[in-house]
């Protein structure tokens, strides 16, 4: 079921080999998976209450964002 | 509206099958990943499974792993929880749940689980 | 497996007390704590995710704070709404574990 040897060293640490292209790194498995069907509703900032505008975002721009970004929820995945 | 409606609890013997449904509302379904989790009577909350957005990948609690099997129908919407080899440890009200992710760069974080079917118990009794 | 302890196992509020919960994890577990209200009868409802984000529609009244091992949801002033079983979840790695649950109850 596993997608292969590439993973991080532990929760917090970089990446040493980023997933290939159209992949993400799920922290909860450990392993990279499909980054298909991203439909992302914006956060919000902690403690806030009122719901969060939507929005889409493809999937080349995800895997392409910086990992220094703000965490975007994120439907599907797993 | 987001929702998860649950069928197939029952009762049965143990040593016996029982199939559990979950039907989302709408076509967001497609795109979730899932859980199965259950609550035995008076006791703590206990995660059985999880399964991907198209069903590629699956894992399962240790106390059902071998018996039970998660899988999906994305073109009817549907979470399947298939329970095999009862036991009456497995008596329990199971809730459905729709896996909550962010997207970090190119790092998913989980957070839980937000949206929740309204529960089937399953007794297994002789 | 990492344990979630959770504490009180149970507890007495009056309407518009200050309440605080604690979940200790066996290891460290970064912000990868959710919290969840349940009442007789009903499924869990999310209220905190990542330990300190609030989800949407939930009152501000509802807090939660704290990394690693230790973690506290605080309910700021208690409503009559409030008193159910509340449980925090970790979600850094499978097996994905629950607390035992903190029943909040009327005095």
């Known amino acids: 079921m596993r997608r292969g040897p590439r993973s991080l060293r532990g929760r917090d640490a970089p990446a040493p080999t980023p997933c290939v292209p159209a992949e993400c790194f799920d922290l909860l498995v450990r392993h990279c998976v499909a980054c298909g069907l991203l439909r992302t509703p914006r956060p919000k900032p902690a403690g806030a209450s009122s719901p969060a505008p939507r929005t889409a975002l493809q999937p080349q721009e995800s895997v392409g964002a910086g990992a220094g970004e703000a965490a975007l929820p994120l439907p599907g995945l797993l | 509206e987001v929702q998860l409606v649950q069928s197939g609890g029952g009762v049965v013997q143990p040593g016996r099958s029982l199939r559990l449904s979950c039907a989302a509302s709408?076509?967001?379904?497609?795109?979730?990943?899932m859980h199965w989790v259950r609550q035995a009577p008076g006791k703590c909350l206990e995660w059985v499974a999880v399964i991907w957005y198209d069903g590629s990948n699956k894992y399962y609690g240790d106390s059902v792993k071998g018996r039970f099997t998660i899988s999906r129908d994305n073109s009817k919407n549907t979470l399947y929880l298939q329970m095999n080899s009862l036991r009456d440890e497995d008596t329990a009200v199971y809730y459905c749940?729709?896996?909550?992710?962010?997207?970090?760069?190119?790092?998913?974080?989980?957070?839980?689980?937000?949206?929740w079917g309204q529960g089937t118990t399953v007794t297994v009794s002789s | 497996e990492i344990v979630l302890t959770q504490s009180p196992s149970s507890l007495s509020a009056s309407v518009g007390d200050r309440v605080t919960i604690t979940c200790r994890a066996s290891?460290?577990?970064?912000?990868?704590l959710n919290w969840y209200q349940q009442k007789p009868g009903k499924a869990p409802k999310l209220l905190i995710y990542?330990?300190?984000s609030l989800q949407s529609g939930v009152p501000s009244r509802f807090s939660g704070s704290g990394s690693g091992t230790d973690f506290t949801l605080t309910i700021s002033s208690l409503q009559p709404e409030d008193f159910a079983t509340y449980y925090c979840?970790?979600?850094?790695?499978?097996?994905?574990?629950f607390g035992c649950g903190t029943k909040v109850e009327i005095k």
């Open positions: 979840q970790q979600s850094y790695s499978t097996p994905l574990t």
């Open positions: 709408g076509e967001w379904f497609s795109s979730y990943g």
């Open positions: 290891q460290s577990i970064s912000s990868y």
């Open positions: 749940a729709r896996r909550f992710t962010h997207l970090r760069g190119w790092i998913i974080e989980d957070y839980g689980m937000d949206v």
């Open positions: 990542a330990a300190s």
